[in-house]
């Protein structure tokens, strides 16, 4: 079992040693300056009060300095994500100092004990930063702490204890258990750095959540609602990763935050955007695709500092792998029914045709229920950049497509047996691109033919009349 540690966070090495060295104590936290992109390279170990390694290892006092802080570990080894992140930081910021905070001895414990050690590790990082601040040209404003899971709260403590204010802290799916709902001084919070951005990827809304659910930064980003990440479903982990265990599924979702951050470093040309929204349900309904008043932002490394915001919840959809970027669209569809068939819940699909590419058949997800004789809002997203939208095809799935729909059809028939021929009228669809903020209105090809029934399709083209909205491009997208 792990070696005991003292209250000052020092690890007593009480192993097989000669008497003379029996009292030797070692710091429980090590700082490894990664001097090479080669993951096998041993790097340089820095320690407070010893300036020689800074010179020997070419520590750049004027450059950005990243501290990567791992979380709880069951194996006691650095996991594979770590050298991926180191490499990505070196690729993006060639002159930067990349320091790995090795607190493995204190993290390789029971989870509760590891949690109790976070404060001591935060203190160690703060002491290192205080010492570096004594050096000429070193600025705390250039320091970026990146903490994964439990490491995010370690970063919070470090930011809290340091003399001055750290430039930035990024929390990568900060740990939930023992941190959810606690006082701001005992977890990551916006007060811990000049800018605190957080990615939440495994926040279950029921039971024990591995990642913290509550917002803890200036901006808190919840990719895919912050819970079920594409590519991490049970079928995915059995199929593509061939992991096949619940723990690997958990790991996949929890670790996704790291990969989203790495993606933001290495795929600069494909930045992912998140949109401010009060909750995941509203986002899924397509209500929150606005970039006005700083309501959207890049995610990960490219996030723009928003000091005025606190605990601002932001959402986006992603792909299952790198590059994670998708293209979001809000569809506003006015559905009219002469039959007043209130229980009609059609299974609708849309295909978008663009100047660059065409989308797949995209489902219009009904988050609550479709309101008839009203405007319904939907969110759809594509993995490819379609370019300018030219036309679209709306399809109402027929009875034969699925057992679920067969049941729906049967239920609808029971509720209104006198009127089995259900029909909806849709004259136009208003589309807004989340990424470009452009709005376009599409009308049915033939104004006299705007009805659709199960198993049928309806084509829409850019409106020729005054329904076409002005093209508005947010200046935000130029920041990408």
């Amino acid at each position: 079992s792990p070696v005991p540690f003292g209250p000052e966070g020092r690890l007593e090495d009480k192993l097989h040693k000669p008497k003379a060295t029996q009292t030797e104590v070692k710091p429980s936290v090590r700082f490894n300056l990664r001097t090479s992109k080669d993951p096998e390279h041993e790097g340089c170990y820095l320690s407070v009060g010893h300036s020689q390694p800074l010179e020997d290892c070419s520590f750049n006092m004027t450059a950005k300095t990243f501290f990567i802080i791992h979380g709880w570990t069951m194996s006691g080894i650095f996991e594979n994500w770590l050298h991926k992140l180191v490499s990505a930081l070196h690729t993006r910021e060639k002159d930067a100092n990349v320091v790995v905070v090795d607190w493995l001895p204190l993290a390789h414990q029971l989870y509760t004990d590891a949690v109790n050690n976070t404060r001591v590790v935060g203190h160690s990082i703060a002491r290192m930063l205080d010492w570096l601040q004594e050096k000429d040209d070193f600025s705390l404003g250039n320091v970026h702490l990146i903490g994964y899971s439990l490491g995010a709260h370690v970063a919070g403590y470090a930011g809290n204890f340091v003399k001055g204010t750290v430039g930035r802290i990024t929390g990568l799916d900060p740990a939930g258990p023992m941190f959810e709902g606690v006082d701001i001084n005992r977890r990551l919070s916006p007060d811990d750095a000049d800018f605190v951005d957080v990615l939440h990827t495994y926040t279950l809304s029921f039971g024990l959540s591995i990642g913290i659910r509550m917002p803890v930064g200036h901006i808190d980003i919840y990719p895919n609602g912050g819970d079920f990440q594409p590519g991490c479903g049970f079928n995915d982990v059995i199929g593509s990763f061939a992991y096949g265990t619940i723990s690997e599924m958990v790991k996949c979702e929890h670790e996704r935050a790291v990969h989203l951050f790495v993606d933001s470093l290495v795929n600069q040309d494909k930045p992912s955007f998140a949109f401010q929204c009060t909750d995941s349900s509203r986002f899924k309904r397509g209500i929150c695709l606005s970039c006005r008043k700083n309501r959207c932002n890049n995610i990960g490394y490219n996030a723009k500092k928003m000091r005025k915001k606190r605990n601002s919840k932001m959402y986006l959809k992603t792909r299952a792998g790198m590059p994670f970027k998708v293209y979001h669209y809000q569809l506003k569809v006015h559905m009219f029914s002469y039959n007043n068939s209130g229980d009609t819940q059609p299974t609708l699909y849309i295909t978008l045709y663009g100047s660059n590419a065409d989308s797949q058949n995209l489902p219009l997800e009904i988050v609550e229920k479709i309101e008839l004789n009203a405007t319904n809002t939907f969110l759809v997203y594509t993995e490819e950049d379609l370019g300018d939208l030219l036309k679209m095809r709306l399809t109402w799935e027929g009875v034969a497509h699925s057992w679920y729909n067969l049941w729906n059809e049967f239920r609808n028939y029971l509720s209104q047996p006198s009127n089995p021929s259900r029909e909806l009228y849709i004259r136009r669809i208003r589309v807004k691109s989340g990424e470009t903020q452009r709005k376009v209105t599409f009308c049915t090809q033939d104004p006299t033919k705007s009805s659709i029934s199960p198993g049928q399709e309806l084509w829409f083209h850019k409106c020729q009349d005054g329904w076409k909205m002005k093209n508005k491009t947010s200046p935000f997208v130029n920041l990408a």
């Epitope: 070696v3 070692k26 990664r34 041993e42 194996s75 996991e79 594979n80 790995v100 001895p105």
Partner: antibody, heavy 120, light 112 residues
Framework: QIQLVQSGPELKKPGETVKISCKAS????????MNWVKQAPGKGLKWMGW????????TYTDDFKGRFAFSLETSASTAFLQINNLKNEDTATYFC?????????????WGQGTTLTVSS | DIVLTQSPASLAVSLGQRATISCKAS??????????MHWYQQKPGQPPKLLIY???NLESGIPARFSGSGSGTDFTLNIHPVEEEDAATYYC??????????FGGGTKLEIK
């Protein structure tokens, strides 16, 4: 140059204890983890576990929990494998091998091996 | 635990010909574009020696006639052209994230 030098062959009786050493040179001992690998006569390689040479925390695989103990003498850059209550099936060659903490955890340098024979 | 199955258990190859050894994992050993599969050579009375790391990277000092390929669950070690000194037992090993790390059963290569 980097070297891992292990102690010489051992002949033991069942129930006894053996302690095998692995002395490292040519690199900073505490900057790399140390593995132990067992190879029974005419058989393949079996990973026993590893020890964090900085913290001294050992990790054992399920088959090697109980009678086996990894330890260190950091000042002498030496790792130890101790096997208590020896059994006939412990007869094997034992290798130490280092790996990088930060990389892909392959074993880049190996000791020459220590042959242990357990026989009554 | 990830089980590695090597085939064939033994093979005899003529001098100058190609030797191909396969290693199949019970589940993927890939991680974010990297394969955590490594190959070792062991001669009688000697410790194993690292040949290939991360599926296809040649360890320094190893002759270029050794090459590795594969991803996911299927990996291959190729030796071409085979030389006399290549007679040995070859092992694959996976180190994908959390231990236990495991070795394949080994393939004995004889030179005809």
């Amino acid at each position: 140059q980097i070297q891992l030098v292990q102690s010489g062959p051992e002949l033991k009786k069942p129930g006894e204890t053996v302690k095998i050493s692995c002395k490292a040179s040519g690199y900073t001992f505490t900057n790399y983890g140390m593995n132990w690998v067992k190879q029974a006569p005419g058989k393949g390689l079996k990973w026993m576990g590893w020890i964090n040479t900085y913290s001294g925390v050992p990790t054992y695989t399920d088959d090697f929990k109980g009678r086996f103990a990894f330890s260190l003498e950091t000042s002498a850059s030496t790792a130890f494998l101790q096997i208590n209550n020896l059994k006939n099936e412990d007869t094997a060659t034992y290798f130490c091998a280092r790996f990088s903490y930060y990389g892909r955890h392959y074993f880049d340098y190996w000791g020459q091996g220590t042959t242990l024979t357990v026989s009554s | 635990d990830i089980v590695l199955t090597q085939s064939p258990a033994s093979l005899a190859v003529s001098l100058g010909q190609r030797a191909t050894i396969s290693c199949k994992a019970s589940q993927s050993v890939d991680y974010d574009g990297d394969s955590y599969m490594h190959w070792y050579q062991q001669k009688p009375g000697q410790p194993p020696k690292l040949l290939i790391y991360a599926a296809s990277n040649l360890e320094s000092g190893i002759p270029a006639r050794f090459s590795g390929s594969g991803s996911g669950t299927d990996f291959t070690l190729n030796i071409h052209p085979v030389e006399e000194e290549d007679a040995a037992t070859y092992y694959c090993q996976q180190t994908n994230d959390d231990p236990p790390w495991t070795f394949g059963g080994g393939t004995k290569l004889e030179i005809k």
